[in-house]
């Protein structure tokens, strides 16, 4: 029986250039967490196994770091990240339970309002 | 080097059981999953059984057309999967092949070079 | 009748490209990471693509791999005689709580 459940950061937002952590957390079980898997729609991010270790895709190895913990840090970010991230929790004995992150990167507010106001 | 040998194949009568085993050298045995896979005379690859590295508590996984008559099992201290087939028919003809699977839900990077089975009266 | 679909044949002349795609469920594709297997003849499967789209070192980069929804492909860019074999689409399946293959396409290069 899954008693545990994902909580993660939910709706977040960062700027166009600047990094983000994704981060979720399984409570409320007693099971082992054997892997963990950052997924975007159809594209592996990377996966965290406990035996193993960490496998970043090669897609996005200068671009994203392992941690803090299990979470994952996506860096130089650009407006195409925006979208859903999946954290997907491999336990025992529980089975899988999968969390959502959706993450909306902005243009720069620098870059949009620096000009007005420059100081003359 | 990654190593893996399969044995105990061989011509057996419908219903007779046989038990295939693969040896495994080469690599940390105990924390990979490992899995069997079978291929009938031209045919495609059937995935047969699976069983979780010891992380996950040696699980065991079946396909629908041999639950509950195959029989998956590991001795991680000598480093060797096995497969219990019993009431064998037919249909179970085929080269048997053992593969490692890395990562949960990962690939099968290492296969062996299989064993045949022929189910035969 | 196999979990997921895959053309029984596919073929191309020397240089061209081939691309075989490989048709699934919500339950197996649409949830999880697709695997290419190419199996030449007369020898055990070898890993070919994994995780949708990584390639094993020494796998030549004309091999490439995507997956969208509950469908994914391979293509070969510039198909050479050497790459005649039966090629598998793979996937783990949350209904079957098991690995699924495709029926497999068997590749003559022309």
């Known amino acids: 029986m899954m008693t545990g459940t994902i909580e993660t950061t939910g709706n977040i937002s960062a700027e166009k250039g600047g990094s983000i952590i994704l981060q979720c957390h399984l409570s409320s079980t007693t099971a082992q967490v054997t892997q963990v898997n950052w997924e975007q729609q159809d594209q592996l991010l990377a996966i965290c196994n406990a035996d193993l270790g960490w496998h970043i895709s090669p897609s996005f190895k200068d671009r994203v770091a392992p941690g803090p913990g299990l979470g994952l840090t996506l860096q130089s970010l650009t407006v195409n990240d925006t979208g859903e991230y999946f954290c997907i929790y491999h336990t025992y004995p529980d089975g899988t339970y999968t969390g959502r992150i959706f993450l909306e990167v902005l243009e720069s507010s620098v870059a949009e309002h620096g000009a007005r106001f420059q100081i003359p | 080097d990654v190593q893996l040998v399969e044995s105990g194949g061989g011509v057996v009568r419908p219903g007779e059981s046989l038990r295939l085993s693969c040896a495994a050298s080469?690599?940390?045995?105990?924390?990979?999953?490992m899995n069997w896979v079978r291929q009938a005379p031209g045919e495609g690859l059937e995935w047969v059984s699976g069983?979780?590295?010891?992380?996950?508590?040696?699980?065991?996984y079946y396909a629908d057309s041999v639950r509950g008559w195959f029989t998956v099992s590991r001795d991680n201290s000598k480093n060797t999967l096995y497969l219990q087939m019993s009431s064998l028919r037919a249909e179970d003809t085929a080269v048997y092949y053992c593969?490692?699977?890395?990562?949960?839900?990962?690939?099968?990077?290492?296969w062996g070079l299989g064993t045949l089975v022929t189910v035969s009266s | 009748q196999s979990v997921l679909t895959q053309p029984p044949s596919a073929s191309g002349t020397p240089g061209q490209r081939v691309t075989i795609s490989c048709s699934g469920s919500?339950?197996?594709?649409?949830?999880?990471?697709v695997y290419w297997y190419q199996q030449l003849p007369g020898t055990a499967p070898k890993l070919l693509i994994y995780?949708?789209?990584e390639r094993p070192s020494g796998v030549p980069d004309r091999f490439s791999g995507s997956k969208s929804g509950t469908s994914a492909s391979l293509a070969i860019s510039g198909v050479q005689s050497e790459d005649e074999a039966d090629y598998y689409c793979?996937?783990?399946?949350?209904?079957?709580?098991?690995?699924?293959f495709g029926g497999g396409t068997k590749l003559t290069v022309l």
């Open positions: 995780f949708n789209n």
């Open positions: 593969a490692r699977e890395t990562w949960i839900r990962g690939y099968f990077d290492y």
């Open positions: 080469g690599f940390n045995f105990s924390t990979y999953a």
């Open positions: 919500r339950s197996n594709l649409g949830n999880n990471l």
């Open positions: 793979a996937t783990w399946d949350d209904s079957l709580n098991g690995w699924v």
């Open positions: 069983i979780s590295g010891r992380s996950s508590g040696d699980t065991t």
